[in-house]
């Protein structure tokens, strides 16, 4: 996979203890019943593999057909493999479902690299390790694809959790989460804890390990430490947010904050890397290189292509800087910052050197479609997609990978003026010209 691919970087063994997690006391504002507390049945319901995505088990049809589905906050279609494919162990067989309804409509989704196309229908859908409900949802039955499914990834479909505006073929196709909230009493909120292993996992380890949690309808206190800080969802299409400042090891990049959000900034579990607009990427890499100048690395490493290896256990984490993104806060002129470690932005890669080595790819890359806060960012944090209140919350993840000297952080408040000016206003275009892929 290339460094720009829109699939998450990894899952696996996190730093938090597994098993039952008890809710803890909080002094945060009370919210309506059912929104907070312990969601034991949903904790640890995600699995996955390096660079290939976090997936949840879902059932489709009657009788239920079990499939693993990639969790993607950067798209809005529920789409599943519905025909034989060399990379699929199983697929949705519509003819075996008594509750399948054909919408007699096709859908075609081109990515920058690759595509999928299929036929639209509806069927009954549930999430075994989720809320105890069944909903009738739109399903795109993928009949043809190119460079979409990944060999060995163990998922057979994609759950687009973003808003209807970016659904294909158009915004009239109701996304799964909208259907779920409309048809049930599930609150209009979900939260994600993606747990990076910090080291590569082979296939059997992945299947046996935990990749994180998708809490549908609530917030589980055991999945984070400290406080949740919220940033407004600027516009309900992607999960768009506004970055107001960027620091490398505490040094401000000192760019016009519009550059950080050119042409948008989104939170996307379906992207591996932290992806930055060209100018921001160049400034950030220059700063990271300067901070880590005691060692030099090949040009291809900074392009996310070449791997750098160290003898097992000797990775010099301390020479790499922390990266802080300041996000617009909920209060006027107030921001907060999220800080990630090299343990998040250096991605462990498997099967390339000897067992005596730890090898990594640089997981920050250049974007022509704005900032994408992919798994590199999300693996540091518990992320709350509070659709009801049009906001996204960040707290330090209980499973993030760190060392004895530094930890990921969510801190605030900071005074930041004129934050509204940091948003970029995309000129209105014919929607048919939009590219789905974020390569």
């Amino acid at each position: 996979t290339q460094h720009g691919i829109r699939l998450p970087l990894r899952s696996g063994l996190g730093g938090a203890p597994l098993g039952l997690r008890l809710p803890r006391e909080t002094d945060e504002e009370p919210e309506e019943p059912g929104r907070r507390g312990s969601f034991v049945e949903m904790v640890d319901n995600l699995r996955g593999k390096s660079g290939q995505g976090y997936y949840v088990e879902m059932t489709v049809g009657s009788p239920p057909q079990t499939l693993n589905i990639l969790v993607d906050t950067g798209s809005s279609n529920f789409a599943v493999g519905a025909a034989p494919h060399p990379f699929l162990h199983r697929y949705y067989q519509r003819q075996l479902s008594s509750t399948y309804r054909d919408l007699r409509k096709g859908v075609y989704v081109p990515y920058t690299q690759g595509k999928w196309e299929g036929e639209l229908g509806t069927d009954l859908v549930s999430i075994p390790h989720g809320p105890n409900v069944t909903v009738r949802a739109n399903i795109a039955a993928i009949t043809e694809s190119d460079k979409f499914f990944i060999n060995g990834s163990n998922w057979e479909g994609i759950l687009g959790l973003a808003y209807a505006e970016i659904a294909r073929p158009d915004d009239s196709l109701e996304p799964f989460f909208d259907s779920l909230v409309k048809q049930t009493h599930v609150p209009n909120l979900f939260s994600l804890q993606l747990c990076g292993a910090g080291f590569p996992l082979n296939q059997s380890e992945v299947l046996a390990s935990v990749g994180g949690s998708m809490i549908i309808g609530g917030i589980d206190h055991s999945l984070y430490t400290g406080s949740l800080w919220y940033t407004p969802i600027r516009r309900e299409w992607y999960y768009e947010v506004i970055i107001v400042r960027v620091e490398i090891n505490g040094q401000d990049l000192k760019m016009d904050c519009k550059e950080y959000n050119y042409d948008k900034s989104i939170v996307d579990s379906g992207t591996t890397n932290l992806r930055l607009p060209k100018k921001v990427f160049e400034a950030a890499v220059k700063s990271i290189k300067a901070a880590s100048s005691t060692e030099k690395f090949p040009d291809g490493f900074w392009l996310g292509e070449q791997l750098v290896c160290w003898q097992a256990g000797t990775t010099p984490w301390n020479i790499f800087p922390v990266i802080s993104l300041y996000l617009m806060g909920e209060v006027t002129n107030q921001s907060f910052r999220i800080t990630i470690l090299p343990q998040q932005y250096l991605r462990p890669v498997e099967d390339v050197a000897t067992s005596q080595d730890d090898c990594y790819k640089f997981a920050i890359s250049q974007s022509s479609t704005g900032t994408v806060m992919g798994a590199v960012i999300m693996e540091g944090f518990y992320v709350v997609f509070d659709r009801a209140r049009k906001r996204i919350g960040f707290a330090v993840s209980a499973c993030h990978v760190h060392d004895e000297f530094r930890t990921a952080a969510v801190e605030g408040p900071f005074v930041t003026l004129d934050m509204e000016d940091c948003g970029y206003n995309i000129p209105q275009t014919d929607e048919s010209t939009l590219m789905t892929g974020r390569a």
Partner: antibody, heavy 120, light 108 residues
Framework: QLQLQESGPGLVKPSETLSLTCTVS??????????WGWIRQPPGKGLEWIGQ???????FYNPSLKSRVTISVDTSKNQFSLKLSSVTAADTAVYYC????????????WGRGTLVTVSS | EIVLTQSPATLSLSPGERATLSCRAS??????LAWFQQKPGQAPRLLIY???NRATGIPARFSGSGSGTDFTLTISSLEPEDFAVYYC??????????FGGGTKVEIK
């Protein structure tokens, strides 16, 4: 024009330490554009990377040799050195020093090599 | 560990003929591959880097191609001075420690 020249004893006894020096002439070892490396080639066999160093002293070693290898740099003398301890007959080889250029990725300039024989 | 396999081990050709040397990686190394030439009693010389770029001073009859796992060094018309051993090396995994076993191009 930049040149590399290896120097050191051609015969080392088993269990002793092999010591070689590479002198860089016609350019500065303190250039930020290069690493400096050692590669060896046993008689009639292929090439084996030993390790490399940046002028700041940052080193990378072949895991199979790491416990026995030390590479150091002396910027004042425009030299870098190789020490390989506890040698055996299997360490008999032509030892080359080389420059790692093209974005720190490729050995684009090599010394002529020096044969080191391990024998009592 | 990435293993580079060169074939054939020996290639017997006459001057003026075209030489095609293969280097296969056990897994993808993208385009991060070099080719070296080594004559008897001499140090290796960099011919090609990044799979297809000729190093400074290398004649145009040498060309490299390929990406991923399969790479080829082509000498369009062999000159007498081209008879030597050729090695490939991957630098996708860095530091660049993996060389192929070599292909000897000898006079037929």
């Amino acid at each position: 024009q930049l040149q590399l020249q290896e120097s050191g004893p051609g015969l080392v006894k088993p269990s002793e330490t092999l010591s070689l020096t590479c002198t860089v002439s016609g350019g500065s070892i303190s250039s930020s554009s290069y690493y400096w490396g050692w590669i060896r080639q046993p008689p009639g066999k292929g090439l084996e990377w030993i390790g490399q160093i940046y002028y700041s002293g940052s080193t990378f070693y072949n895991p199979s040799l790491k416990s026995r290898v030390t590479i150091s740099v002396d910027t004042s003398k425009n030299q870098f050195s190789l020490k390989l301890s506890s040698v055996t007959a299997a360490d008999t080889a032509v030892y080359y020093c080389a420059r790692l250029g093209h974005g720190y990725s490729y050995f684009d300039l090599w010394g002529r090599g020096t044969l080191v024989t391990v024998s009592s | 560990e990435i293993v580079l396999t060169q074939s054939p081990a020996t290639l017997s050709l006459s001057p003026g003929e075209r030489a095609t040397l293969s280097c296969r990686a056990s897994q993808s190394v993208s385009s991060y591959l070099a080719w070296f030439q080594q004559k008897p009693g001499q140090a290796p010389r960099l011919l090609i880097y990044d799979a297809s770029n000729r190093a400074t001073g290398i004649p145009a009859r040498f060309s490299g191609s390929g990406s991923g796992t399969d790479f080829t060094l082509t000498i369009s018309s062999l000159e007498p001075e081209d008879f030597a051993v050729y090695y490939c090396q991957q630098v996708y995994v860095w530091p660049p420690r993996t060389f192929g076993g070599g292909t000897k191009v000898e006079i037929k």
